[in-house]
Amino acid sequence: ASHSGMINPSRQWQTLKQNTGVAHFEYQIRVTCDDYYYGFGCNKFCRPRDDFFGHYACDQNGNKTCMEGWMGPECNRAICRQGCSPKHGSCKLPGDCRCQYGWQGLYCD
């Protein structure tokens, strides 16, 4: 027995039924992507990392989900302390607020 057609990657088993006239076949099949690959064509890659290149996990669709305190397309931009002046403060670590020269205070304001 042979089956022709698209089977999308999924964790679920699919039941396929086939009647050849001589015999009736019923079988279960599933297609899974290799580790860290996602999507219908398994053509999306996501592997969690927490380093210079980014701080993220991966959701079930292979999208990067930034760890708490990080943002940006690659999750490598820290979210500063709430209230930190966008003009006179900045941060390289989440929750931080480093003041420009000549400015001070908890929020560099």
Epitope: D35, Y37, K92
Partner: antibody, heavy 116, light 107 residues
Framework: QVQLVQSGAELKKPGASVKVSCKVS????????IHWIRQAPGQGLEWMGI????????KYNQKFKDRVTMTVDKSTSTAYMELSSLRSEDTAVYYC?????????WGQGTLVTVSS | DIQMTQSPSSLSASVGDRVTITCRTS??????LTWYQQKPGKAPKLLVY???ILAAGVPSRFSGSGSGTDFTLTISSLQPEDFATYYC?????????FGGGTKLEIK
């Protein structure tokens, strides 16, 4: 469209420094890191380092660590690579490139010739 | 540093041939591997990233496979425009390094 435009060819004497620029357009400059790669005549590709364009933090190939400096000017969306104490072996085409999962966008290359 | 061993260093083939280039790394890099094509006087062009994902606009005759330490770039049916030099590169850890290149020539 995304473009990375590099500065022109340079002729330098041994011991001098060179600063190559890479001006980007077509996307938010601080969203993606910039890498620098070089290629000596008839040779392969050599990764020099990466700069986080948002913070200006760099990571260098140890081979160049004491001689290379990568910087950015966010106001002009330009990345710079400066290589000091030049020697003849530094004669190469220097490329800037954008990306994390491979370099989809490259500058046109800058030929740096080191000769006395 | 992670060493990249690319083979063969040069290869002669004919239009229509199936060609395979391999890249072996000195340690596990998962799927952090990229393949490039370079023609004389031009910047490299991205072909495949994350070991097996075809870059936008790249013909389907190119394919990548492998994970861990062993990787392959395959061209299923060589076209005249495919004669060039091919490089693999890892982007797992610093420094990112390139293979030595494979020069693909017309037989």
């Amino acid at each position: 469209q995304v473009q990375l435009v590099q500065s022109g060819a340079e002729l330098k004497k041994p011991g001098a420094s060179v600063k190559v620029s890479c001006k980007v357009s077509g996307y938010a400059f601080t969203d993606y890191a910039i890498h620098w790669i070089r290629q000596a005549p008839g040779q392969g590709l050599e990764w020099m380092g990466i700069i986080n364009t948002y913070y200006g933090d760099s990571k260098y190939n140890q081979k160049f660590k004491d001689r290379v400096t990568m910087t950015v000017d966010k106001s002009t969306s330009t990345a710079y690579m400066e290589l000091s104490s030049l020697r003849s072996e530094d004669t190469a085409v220097y490329y800037c490139a954008r990306g994390y999962d491979g370099f989809a966008y490259w500058g046109q290359g800058t030929l740096v010739t080191v000769s006395s | 540093d992670i060493q990249m061993t690319q083979s063969p260093s040069s290869l002669s083939a004919s239009v229509g041939d199936r060609v395979t280039i391999t890249c072996r790394t000195s340690e596990n890099i998962y799927s952090y591997l990229t393949w490039y094509q370079q023609k004389p006087g031009k910047a490299p062009k991205l072909l495949v990233y994350n070991a097996k994902i075809l870059a936008a606009g790249v013909p389907s005759r190119f394919s990548g496979s492998g994970s861990g330490t062993d990787f392959t770039l395959t061209i299923s049916s060589l076209q005249p425009e495919d004669f060039a030099t091919y490089y693999c590169q890892h982007h797992y850890d610093i420094p990112w390094t390139f293979g030595g290149g494979t020069k693909l020539e017309i037989k």
